[in-house]
Interface confidence: low
């Protein structure tokens, strides 16, 4: 039975009918509705929003919509004992205190339950000591401090600027350096675009604005107390001392007005080079400690936040497939926000809502997708991707057998310049073909395709005439599906011009100023970029759920595998003598990649020729495509990161947001020249090459003729 027998709409109009039903005005209306009050994970307000979404998805026409709840570890400031940082004099008197809250934006002065800026999961503590400025607190920044400048951070409070890498990596690096506290701040160099006003007059960060965020190093574990398993009613929970990924030193974020007060007194060493200087009118001295007249003054942190096991709620909607109901295409994005969530996440949640409404409209007219579509409104993403991870842990056996694809739907915009896509190579051709069919919303590209404007503004560094598509890293809800379960995944949003705007993320990220008005006034007044993102995300889901043959091209994986093998080989070849001494060879990896390329080519030829009317053969070929991503999963996981199991891609060990290729080999090679036991270190490189070569070869064989 073909999918068309389950519908009143002819096949060539299916996608068009779906896309035409998507309306910018609806997305705008939904965004407004979702952003009037805070929806912090674990709060009553966010539970009420979950029930509202459940009710509306049912009205839209989904077959079922359920709430899936979990009891996970969350973190909140103490309402009666606020967090702050002081400068204290030699008598211990506080002569300067950082602000306790962000000045509320116009129109929101009387809103209750705005959580003050804090670093989620910071332990309590009141450390005091000398300050050391550590730039972005990246691995290379600490190398510069410790190895080149001989500055010891042990027992010091470090101050780091936000940006470049995930804040949890900054905290981990500071801990490893022996720091006893971390102050995170937003420097105007990274969060204030020149020539743009600060909110409410523009989209820049005001001096009192502060970025909230979690500082965990979960490495894909989900709830810190129940790694690997769902945090359900009968869960066994670890003690807090054995919890996964919690920081061990107090951490607190501040804005640049407060940072100015701390940094202006800094003494000690001068910054090593201009890359360590931000845009404040301070010397950016590294320290340790304050200069001259202020040398007896210290910095003291006052952190009283608590970790609490709290109930969270995912909303899971189902649109049953007519032909292959046991094959799941998932569209998911989170619902919880730090405050109002004007961009993160509600610009994404509003798009998901409109996509559900459009699919529901088609279903009410008699249509069904070929495969089942699952829609998810995840909770507690901001606290470590907890909602999505717990749900995936609970449903892992179903997902690993039935999961076709996962499309992520967090923030729809982080700018309004061009499209940004990160996805598995299996989806490259799907994204290319889809964007060629969509109209560009960009000024100057009227009547042109989205593919054309995207390619022009964000060209591929390798292939001329094609757009850039990036590797998946982490820091969002696709993580468990891709990195742990090996389900083909992708994400799309509108972004800024990275060439001219070198700030990190968007300036008002995770601040109280991320409001509906920020989007409506400054980013997307016509909601045309939101509509385009809805078309891309929704179109991908539509094709994945409805095409007779899955729209995956395994040949694109072959191309990137060769590129990644070349890259990791060139990194290793920076140590030619050691490679010779320890007999390090990449022959097995290149051989496996060659085999993969040949087998993928032959598979693609068979895919063109097979009898698509034979449901058994069709299912067999589709299963080979579906399970290809799964074949890159190593059940043992990466070293010390058991929940990162994808051998080709993992979040960088130095920046959770970034994807790294052949991460096992990369990490084994990283800083290898400093290892105390070179023989052991190069042995691990050889082992990782072996694992990678085996995995690529094994994946190739899943594409071979079955008998």
């Amino acid at each position: 039975k073909s999918s068309n027998e389950a519908t009143n709409i002819t096949p060539k109009h299916n996608m068009k009918a779906f896309l035409d039903e998507l309306k910018a005005e609806n997305i705008k209306k939904f965004l407004y509705n979702f952003t009037q009050i805070p929806h912090l994970a674990g709060t009553e307000q966010n539970f009420q929003l979950a029930k509202q979404i459940q009710s509306q998805w049912k009205e839209f026409g989904l077959d079922s919509v359920e709430l899936a709840h979990y009891d996970v570890l969350l973190s909140y400031p103490n309402k009666t004992h606020p967090n702050y940082i002081s400068i204290i004099n030699e008598d211990g008197n506080e002569i300067f205190n950082t602000s306790l809250f962000e000045p509320p934006p116009p129109g929101y002065e009387n809103v209750s339950d705005i959580v003050p800026p804090f670093s989620a999961f910071s332990p309590q503590g009141m450390p005091e000591g000398d300050l050391v400025y550590v730039n972005y607190a990246r691995t290379e920044d600490f190398f510069k401090l410790e190895r080149d400048m001989k500055i010891n951070c042990s027992g010091k409070i470090v101050i780091a600027r936000y940006g470049k890498v995930f804040r949890g990596n900054k905290v981990k690096n500071a801990q490893l350096a022996g720091a006893k506290g971390v102050i995170l701040y937003s420097d105007p160099a990274d969060y204030f675009a020149p020539g743009v006003k600060s909110y409410p007059d523009g989209w820049n960060l005001p001096g009192g604005g502060v970025q909230r965020g979690n500082i965990l190093n979960l490495n894909g574990a989900g709830d810190p107390l129940t790694p690997g398993y769902p945090a359900n009613e009968y869960a066994y929970r670890r003690g807090i001392a054995e919890a996964v990924g919690l920081p061990s030193i107090p951490v607190h974020p501040i804005g640049y007005y407060d940072a100015q007060k701390l940094l202006e007194k800094m003494g000690g060493s001068a910054p090593p080079d201009s890359s360590w200087r931000g845009s404040l009118k301070v010397p950016y001295n590294v320290g340790p400690g304050f200069t001259g007249n202020f040398s007896t003054q210290k910095v003291k942190m006052h952190i009283h936040s608590t970790n609490e096991v709290t109930r969270i709620y995912n909303v899971i909607g189902t649109l049953r497939g007519a032909v292959e109901p046991d094959r799941y295409v998932i569209l998911g994005g989170h619902r919880d926000s730090w405050v109002f969530g004007g961009i993160d996440p509600q610009s994404g949640a509003a798009v998901v809502h409109e996509i559900v409404r459009s699919f529901g409209t088609l279903k009410k007219e008699g249509w069904r997708p070929r495969r089942t579509i699952l829609f998810a409104s995840w909770d507690a993403e901001e606290f470590g991707l907890l909602g999505s991870t717990e749900w995936a842990e609970e449903n892992s056996r179903l997902l690993q057998e039935r999961g076709v694809a996962y499309i992520n739907a967090d923030s729809s915009i982080e700018g309004n310049y061009t499209l940004r896509v990160d996805c598995t190579p299996l989806m490259y051709s799907l994204v290319h073909n889809l964007t060629k069919e969509l109209k560009s919303p960009d000024e100057g590209f009227e009547g042109k395709s989205l593919y054309e404007s995207w390619t022009k503004k964000s060209p591929s560094p390798e292939f001329s005439g094609m757009p850039r598509i990036s590797k998946l890293g982490s820091g969002n809800d696709f993580e468990v599906f891709f990195q742990r379960l090996g389900i083909a995944s992708g994400r799309a949003r509108y972004t800024k011009n990275w060439e001219t705007n070198k700030f990190s993320g968007y300036p008002l990220y995770h601040s109280v100023y991320e409001t509906y008005e920020l989007v409506e006034k400054f980013y997307d007044p016509m909601f045309k970029y939101h509509l385009t993102v809805a078309q891309v995300r929704g179109g991908m889901v539509f094709e994945l759920a409805n095409s007779i043959v899955l729209p995956f091209d395994c040949r694109d994986y072959a191309v990137v595998l060769r590129k990644y093998a070349d890259k990791i080989y060139s990194i290793s070849m920076k140590h030619p003598q050691e490679m010779k001494t320890y007999s390090v060879s990449f022959d097995s990896l290149f051989s496996a990649v060659k085999n993969f390329t040949e087998i993928a080519s032959k598979f693609s030829e068979r895919l063109q020729d097979f009898d698509k009317s034979n449901p058994i053969v069709l299912r067999m070929m589709n299963d080979q495509l579906m399970f290809l991503e799964r074949a890159f999963i190593d059940p043992l996981g990466l070293p010390d990161r058991p929940f990162y199991r994808h051998v080709i891609y993992a979040p960088s060990s130095h920046n959770k947001y970034a994807g790294e290729s052949f991460p096992g080999i990369y990490d084994a090679l990283f800083d290898i020249e400093s290892k105390v036991d070179p023989s052991k270190a190069w042995g691990e490189v050889k082992r990782q090459i072996y694992v990678a070569a085996f995995t690529v070869q094994a994946a190739a064989e899943t594409l071979s003729e079955v008998a």
């Epitope: 103490n78 009666t80 004992h81 332990p123 807090i240 001392a241 054995e242 608590t306 970790n307 609490e308």
Partner: antibody, heavy 124, light 107 residues
């Protein structure tokens, strides 16, 4: 100034009762677990009891269970220890102490603020 | 009950000496350990929490280390005001228990 000021000690006969008080100032009393710790003459420290911020959870050392009761009045910023059926071995300096939950919202991590201590002597 | 055993029970040292006091738990307590200093007739004072974290206002010559069952308090260079009795305390589970104390006196 953060401080705990104790009162209520004294001499009592075996089997008698005594109520110790501890007045807190300089911090948000209702945000902290509180404790009583004692020290017999010439001996080491012994934890006696803990009470949660809202008084909903209480814990005792086995040797005082059923005889001593820890309580608090957050409106008055005060902590109490009601001691009944006193024995000679209860003779000690009793300290009230603030519990500092430095890592997790648990019931006992470290005692960061201490009262001055009050002597309780149980003797006939 | 988790029993805490401190050693030595007393130590005689001179100003400037490095003094090390050990504390052993009868079962694993992760890093849930605090160290206190007590002078005669005075209330104890918190020095170290979470096994190795220096409480604010405590001189940096005091340091703590260890995890699991074995812990150490080190005074890197003994000062006249450091002559006192030192106690460890576990906060892993109820009942909370203290070590027997180590008296540091003048040699």
């Amino acid at each position: 100034q953060v401080q705990l000021v104790q009162s209520g000690g004294g001499l009592v006969q075996p089997g008698g009762s005594l109520r110790l008080s501890c007045a807190a100032s300089g911090f948000t009393f209702s945000s902290y677990w509180m404790s009583w710790v004692r020290q017999a003459p010439g001996k080491g420290l012994e934890w006696v009891a803990n009470i949660k911020q809202d008084g909903s959870e209480k814990y005792y050392v086995d040797s005082v269970k059923g005889r001593f009761t820890i309580s608090r009045d957050n409106a008055k910023n005060s902590l109490y220890l009601q001691m009944n059926s006193l024995r000679a071995e209860d003779t000690a300096v009793y300290y009230c102490a603030r519990v500092w939950d430095y890592y997790y919202d648990s019931s006992g991590d470290a005692f960061d603020i201490w009262g001055q201590g009050t002597m309780v002597t149980v003797s006939s | 009950v988790i029993w805490m055993t401190q050693s030595p029970s007393s130590v005689s040292a001179s100003v400037g000496d490095r003094v090390t006091i050990t504390c052993r738990a009868s079962q694993g307590i992760s890093s849930w350990l605090a160290w206190y200093q007590q002078k005669p007739g005075k209330a104890p004072k918190l020095l170290i929490y979470a096994a190795s974290n220096l409480q604010s206002g405590v001189p940096s010559r005091f340091s703590g280390s260890g995890s699991g069952t074995d812990f150490t308090l080190t005074i890197s260079s003994l000062q006249p005001e450091d002559f006192a009795t030192y106690y460890c305390q576990q906060a892993n589970s109820f009942p909370l228990t203290f070590g027997g104390g180590t008296k540091v006196d003048i040699k």
